[in-house]
Interface confidence: medium
């Protein structure tokens, strides 16, 4: 079932520049991405971009750069000149449709921890929520344990003190874990009905949907314009991560398909998914 | 097979209410938009209300707008459609469509303000 | 909200007969255009989305052309079946419009 992640980020260099980041999971082949602000298109939001895979992209201020990252996901920068940075509090939200099946649409923000107001630079790392308790007191623990070993293997001075240095993408992978949960939790808690999946796969998005395009028919098979920028975890270190469940091209948003209210943290990253014969595409 | 079927219309004066619904099934209900369409006798298609597949977000026109609420019970599988403050021109048979375009509808039901 | 002006509102032709239907948006709605068929008693049905994609199910006879703000559906052959009620309507924003009509009517 299609999935969609939304990421906003503050540039470090500049407060005031903001940029949004979007993902299509499917499957599907992607027909049209509507990028907006203040909320969904078409229920209080305005629209600042629409991307199309065959004609291009097209944008209203205040957005700046809107570009396909790859075949599954998109960019939009945006530019705030304004002293107060409007964009901070923001809700940004991207619409991906698939037609004939409908749209999926998920929001996102700035993380609190992300405040251009901050006099200095905001901590790349997500502040974590009461509803993580659960996850600091283990991770308590083990660093705890961790200390500990530490201890012991110092006090044995005929062997060196190994120099535990944690990789890059592990901390990413640890920030994904974090954050995603407590953005479901509130969503839960604005939608009763809502099946909140704020999945993603810790492998690039092409490993998602890496055909995407090609499953296109031939005369809508092109390549989506712009550089397509390798695609990393699709979790940036100050941004949001929300996905919300399927919309139709309501411009209708949210997200998806479990029966239940399931949370998936790192879902099963099949690779090329066919296109199932619903499309009806020739 | 993909069903959608209307009830709940019927004759109503003007200024009620009256409350459609739209039962579905064949297919993962919580998973789609669904929306309401209409056509007045004789005349041509008019998009009524959609709701996201959570019921989150609701979109309707300005000719409905604070008159008609679209919502969803996605347990049950059913959409509805509170229409209130009814007027003559709220006379039509009215569709439930899933999808974006409307891929699917329903045999539809009919709603008759009339005094 | 976008208008969709379709034309001509009918047309008579015969079975075997190359049938074109025009609607034009009143601003850009890249390729997002649809086309329903709809016969009388009946609910609309789904013929072309996305401007050429045939739905499932639909006849090869049926072909959608345009992009911008205008479009056009096209049937190749006209078979008795198809004397209908033929709507186009813009999937690009809300609110969803819709053209209003073109009924197909036997020569």
């Known amino acids: 079932t299609p999935e969609v992640w939304v990421q906003v980020q503050m540039e470090a260099t500049e407060l005031s520049s903001f940029t949004v980041h979007c993902g299509f999971l499917g499957p599907g082949s992607i027909s049209l991405v509507t990028v907006s602000w203040g909320g969904p298109d078409g229920a209080g939001g305005t629209k600042l971009a629409v991307l199309h895979p065959e004609l291009g992209t097209r944008q209203w201020a205040p957005a700046r750069q809107a570009r396909w990252e790859t075949q599954s996901s998109i960019s939009l920068a945006l530019e705030d000149s304004g002293a107060s940075s409007p964009f901070a509090n923001t809700t940004f939200c991207c619409k991906f449709a698939s037609f004939p099946e409908g749209s999926w649409e998920s929001c996102g923000s700035l993380p609190p921890s992300s405040d251009p107001g901050l006099s200095a630079p905001p901590t790349p790392v997500p502040i974590l929520r009461a509803d993580l308790a659960g996850i600091l007191g283990l991770s308590g623990v083990l660093l705890f344990g961790c200390g500990y070993l530490l201890h012991l293997l110092r006090r044995q001075k005929h062997r060196p003190t190994p120099r535990l240095q944690p990789s890059h993408t592990n901390s990413q992978a640890l920030t994904a874990q974090a954050w995603a949960p407590s953005q479901a939790s509130q969503a839960a808690l604005h939608d009763p009905y809502a099946t909140i999946n704020t999945s993603f796969c810790p492998a690039t998005l092409d490993t998602a949907h890496p055909n995407g395009w090609a499953s296109l028919p031939t005369h809508a098979a092109h390549q989506p314009q712009g550089p397509a920028a390798s695609a990393s975890t699709p979790i940036l270190a100050r941004g949001s991560f929300v996905s919300v469940e399927n919309g139709l091209y309501t411009q209708a948003g949210e997200r998806p398909p479990h029966t239940g209210p399931g949370l998936t943290l790192f879902p099963d990253c099949r690779g090329p998914r066919a296109v199932e014969g619903r499309f009806g595409v020739r | 097979e993909v069903q959608l079927v209307e009830s709940g219309g019927g004759l109503v004066k003007p200024g009620g209410s009256l409350r459609l619904s739209c039962a579905a099934s064949?297919?993962?209900?919580?998973?789609?938009?669904i929306s309401w369409v209409r056509q007045a006798p004789g005349k041509g298609l008019e998009w009524v209300s959609e709701?996201?597949?959570?019921?989150?977000?609701?979109y309707y026109p300005d000719t409905v707008t604070g008159r008609f609420t679209i919502s969803r019970d996605n347990a049950k599988n059913t959409l509805y459609l509170q229409m209130s403050s009814l007027r003559a021109e709220d006379t039509a048979v009215y569709y439930c469509?899933?999808?974006?375009?409307?891929?699917?509808w329903g045999q539809g039901t009919l709603v008759t303000v009339s005094s | 909200d976008i208008q969709m002006t379709q034309s001509p509102s009918s047309l008579s032709a015969s079975v075997g007969d190359r049938v074109t239907i025009t609607c034009k948006a009143s601003?850009?709605?890249?390729?997002?255009v649809a086309w329903y068929q709809q016969k009388p008693g009946k609910a609309p049905k789904l013929l072309i989305y996305?401007?050429?994609y045939r739905f499932t199910g639909v006849p090869s006879r049926f072909s959608g052309s345009g992009s911008g703000t205008d479009f056009t559906l096209t049937i190749s052959s006209l078979q008795p079946e198809d004397f209908a009620t033929y709507y186009c309507?813009?999937?690009?924003?809300?609110?969803?419009?819709f053209g209003g009509g073109t009924k197909v009517e036997i020569k």
């Open positions: 601003q850009d709605v890249m390729t997002a």
């Open positions: 996305s401007t050429s």
């Open positions: 469509a899933r999808g974006d375009p409307f891929g699917y």
């Open positions: 309507q813009q999937h690009y924003s809300t609110p969803r419009t």
């Open positions: 709701i996201s597949s959570g019921g989150t977000y609701t």
């Open positions: 064949g297919f993962t209900f919580s998973s789609y938009g």
